[in-house]
Structures are given as structure tokens and as C-alpha cells.
């Protein structure tokens, strides 16, 4: 019976068996619902919306890493509908903490204003360099510098959303 079907299965009335929901392709996310025994009649997939990506399957599209606004890093590879963005070295005025375990967001660049003396990325950096950083036009993420208390809970930003 359909109550025995799994998270991504629906009950096929014809065969009397649980059947896999049709998975979405890369760059798509589910439209309507399927799983735990039920499937909407028009269940299907839609392309990922702005600034999100998906590897396919049953996952909703996730936000690209915000290299500049959140990580304070350069963009090595911009994301597309099928791939996340890849971040490069820190932006001018920011540095990477050495020998620090990665947090749940990966490596984050920190302001040179907070750097120990003689930090190589910060030598010659002006104090103003870290005060101005690029943001996402028209929409915003919450950065660990603005909302450090939210970083630990996994809420309030978009690095892995």
C-alpha cells in the first residue's frame, strides 16, 4: 500500500507497487510534489531560478556561493544552473586564517583590520580597503561579519543555501 512507499516513491495503482518519482535533471528542481506514496498528476521539473543551481534528482535548487559578499573572496568560476560558483583568493583587504579548521561554510576571508601584524595578504593594505566590499545588487545575503551569531546556527546567510 502507498503508506509503505519511501520519500521519493509513489504508489502505482496499476502495478500495486511503489515506483520511483521521476528525478529532475541537472539545473532543474521539482514542480509540484511526489513522494511517500503520492504523486501530483502534473508533477515534473522546472529550471532553477536566478542565481541557483541543482545537480538534479529530487533536490531543490540551491543558491550559488556568494564569493564576494559572504566569503570576501574573488570569483574563480561563476555558477550556472548546474554548478555552484567556485571562490578564489581573498579580496584585497582580506586574508585567510591559517591552520584554522574549516567551518560549515568552508574557508572564509577575514578583514585585514583584524589581522595579526605582518600577515602577508595584508601588508600594504589600506584600512579603507576592507570597508568597501561588493554586494549582490538588488538582493542581499547575511554575512558572518554582519550576523556572526547566526553563523553557528546555519541561518541567516546564503553560502550553502
Amino acid at each position: 500500500e502507498y503508506s509503505n512507499c519511501g520519500e521519493n516513491e509513489y504508489y502505482n495503482q496499476t502495478t500495486g507497487l511503489c515506483q520511483e518519482c521521476p528525478p529532475c535533471g541537472p539545473g532543474e528542481e521539482p514542480y509540484l510534489s511526489c513522494g511517500y506514496g503520492t504523486k501530483d498528476e502534473d508533477y515534473g521539473c522546472v529550471p532553477c531560478p536566478a542565481e541557483k543551481f541543482s545537480k538534479g534528482g529530487y533536490q531543490i535548487c540551491r543558491r550559488h556561493k556568494d564569493c564576494e559578499g559572504f566569503f570576501r573572496a574573488t570569483v574563480l568560476t561563476p555558477g550556472d544552473m548546474e554548478n555552484d560558483a567556485e571562490c578564489g583568493p581573498c579580496l584585497p583587504g582580506y586574508y585567510m586564517l591559517e591552520n584554522r579548521p574549516r567551518n560549515i561554510y568552508g574557508m572564509v576571508c577575514y578583514s585585514c583590520l583584524l589581522a595579526p601584524p605582518n600577515t602577508k595578504e595584508c601588508v600594504g593594505a589600506t584600512s579603507g580597503a576592507s570597508a568597501n566590499f561588493p554586494g549582490t545588487s538588488g538582493s542581499s545575503t547575511l554575512s558572518p561579519f554582519q550576523h556572526a551569531h547566526k553563523e553557528l546556527s546555519g541561518q541567516g546567510h546564503l553560502a550553502t543555501a
Epitope: 520519500e7 528542481e29 521539482p30 514542480y31 509540484l32 510534489s33 513522494g35 511517500y36 522546472v46 529550471p47 531560478p49 536566478a50 542565481e51 529530487y58 531543490i60 535548487c61 540551491r62 543558491r63 549582490t136 538588488g138 538582493s139 545575503t141 547575511l142 546556527s153 546555519g154 541561518q155 541567516g156 546567510h157 546564503l158 553560502a159 550553502t160 543555501a161
Partner: antibody, heavy 115, light 107 residues
Framework: EVQLEESGPELVKPGASVRISCKAS????????MHWVKQGPEKSLEWIGE????????IYNQKFEAKATLTVDISSSTTYMQLKSLTSEDSAVYYC????????WGQGTLVTVSA | DIVMTQSPSSLSASLGDRVTISCSAS??????LNWFQQKPDGTIKLLIF???SLHSGVPSRFSGSGSGTDYYLTISNLETEDVAIYYC?????????FGGGTKLEIK
């Protein structure tokens, strides 16, 4: 059947805050982003932001970043939006709507800001 | 932000008519366009997603078309229940933005 049930109307004083809710049912809550949309008296629609219940990730329209705070309670499949420092400009109907094409919408919550 | 301009802002048509509503984006939106219907009681429903895909349960007299910056919602064989305000919405670039709406009335 998928349903998005929003909380009831609110009458609040200028400068105060209000929290409205959107309770989802009929689908796996953590599988979709939840969006919030504002409709002012002139009837135009404005996208406020969205929250991913599975990660807590949030995207705001910059225009509303200082005004709205989105949160989620997975245990009750409910998304919340808090609006702060309210003025008459915030008097509007607020809708929640689900990602994946925006196929489902709540019935709307009327917020009236008046002294 | 991408500006979505709808036209006309209001229109009156007769039962059985074919009606077309236009939506113009300030830049290309690559077919990332939805159409919504808002009934007089405030209820909002998705009609068309991704320019031309008909949402589940929506009558086939509704259709969507367009590309680049110009998009269209067509209602053929207008019925009384189609009295509503219609909105387009782009989701090509954040923040997602809506058109100003088109109020459809029956003559």
C-alpha cells in the same frame, strides 16, 4: 492537498513590530523554499525574500532587509516573517508562496499600521 | 532591478473574446516568466510558469508565449470567471519582480 495557511489580520501601532506566520501542509516542508510577497494598497506585488527550511538559508530583497526577518520552525512546518519599525507604508497584505514555480499561495495576511 | 511593464493596465472585453496581455522586461529574462491571476477576493493562483507551461488545473484557454524581453498571456474564449487582475513575474535575476498588473473586466 498542498495548503499554505497564513495567520489572521493584525492591527499594529507605528514603530511596533509584528510577526505573521505561514503554516504549510500536504508536502515535505523542507523540500522547497518559502517566499514572501507584499501587496500594498495600490495593488502592486513586491518580492520580500525567501527562506530554505532545510538549511535556514535566506535571500532578501535589499529593499526589505532592514524591515523583514524570515525564520522557520521545521517541527510545525511553519515559516515566520517579522516586520519591525512599522510605518503606514507597511500597511499591506502579505502572502507566502512556495518555490518550484510558485504553484501555491497563502490566503494573505492583512497588516494595518495605525495609531 | 529588472522592471516589468504590463500593458494595458486595464481592459474590458466581451464573453467569448480573445484577450492578450503584454509584459515587457527592462532586460532579457530568458523565458523566466510566470503569470498569476488574482481574484477579487485576493486569492492568487499560478496560471503559467516558465513562459508557456500551463499550471496544473488551469483551463487550456490560457496560454503564454514570448522570448527575450517581451512576453504575452492570451485568454481565448473569455469567461465570466476570468474577471481578475493578472500579473507577470520575472525570476531571471534577483530580486524577483512583478508587473504592475492588468485588471480584466467583462463588458
Amino acid at each position: 492537498e498542498v495548503q499554505l495557511e497564513e495567520s489572521g489580520p493584525e492591527l499594529v501601532k507605528p514603530g511596533a513590530s509584528v510577526r505573521i506566520s505561514c503554516k504549510a501542509s500536504g508536502y515535505s516542508f523542507t523540500d522547497y523554499w518559502m517566499h514572501w510577497v507584499k501587496q500594498g494598497p495600490e495593488k502592486s506585488l513586491e518580492w520580500i525574500g525567501e527562506i530554505n527550511p532545510s538549511t535556514g538559508g535566506i535571500i532578501y530583497n535589499q529593499k526589505f532587509e532592514a524591515k523583514a526577518t524570515l525564520t522557520v520552525d521545521i517541527s510545525s512546518s511553519t515559516t515566520y516573517m517579522q516586520l519591525k519599525s512599522l510605518t503606514s507604508e507597511d500597511s499591506a497584505v502579505y502572502y507566502c508562496t512556495r518555490s518550484g514555480g510558485f504553484p501555491y499561495w497563502g490566503q494573505g495576511t492583512l497588516v494595518t499600521v495605525s495609531a | 532591478d529588472i522592471v516589468m511593464t504590463q500593458s494595458p493596465s486595464s481592459l474590458s472585453a466581451s464573453l467569448g473574446d480573445r484577450v492578450t496581455i503584454s509584459c515587457s522586461a527592462s532586460q532579457g529574462i530568458s523565458n523566466y516568466l510566470n503569470w498569476f491571476q488574482q481574484k477579487p477576493d485576493g486569492t492568487i493562483k499560478l496560471l503559467i510558469f516558465y513562459t508557456s507551461s500551463l499550471h496544473s488545473g488551469v483551463p487550456s484557454r490560457f496560454s503564454g508565449s514570448g522570448s527575450g524581453t517581451d512576453y504575452y498571456l492570451t485568454i481565448s474564449n473569455l469567461e465570466t470567471e476570468d474577471v481578475a487582475i493578472y500579473y507577470c513575474q520575472q525570476y531571471s535575476k534577483l530580486p524577483y519582480t512583478f508587473g504592475g498588473g492588468t485588471k480584466l473586466e467583462i463588458k
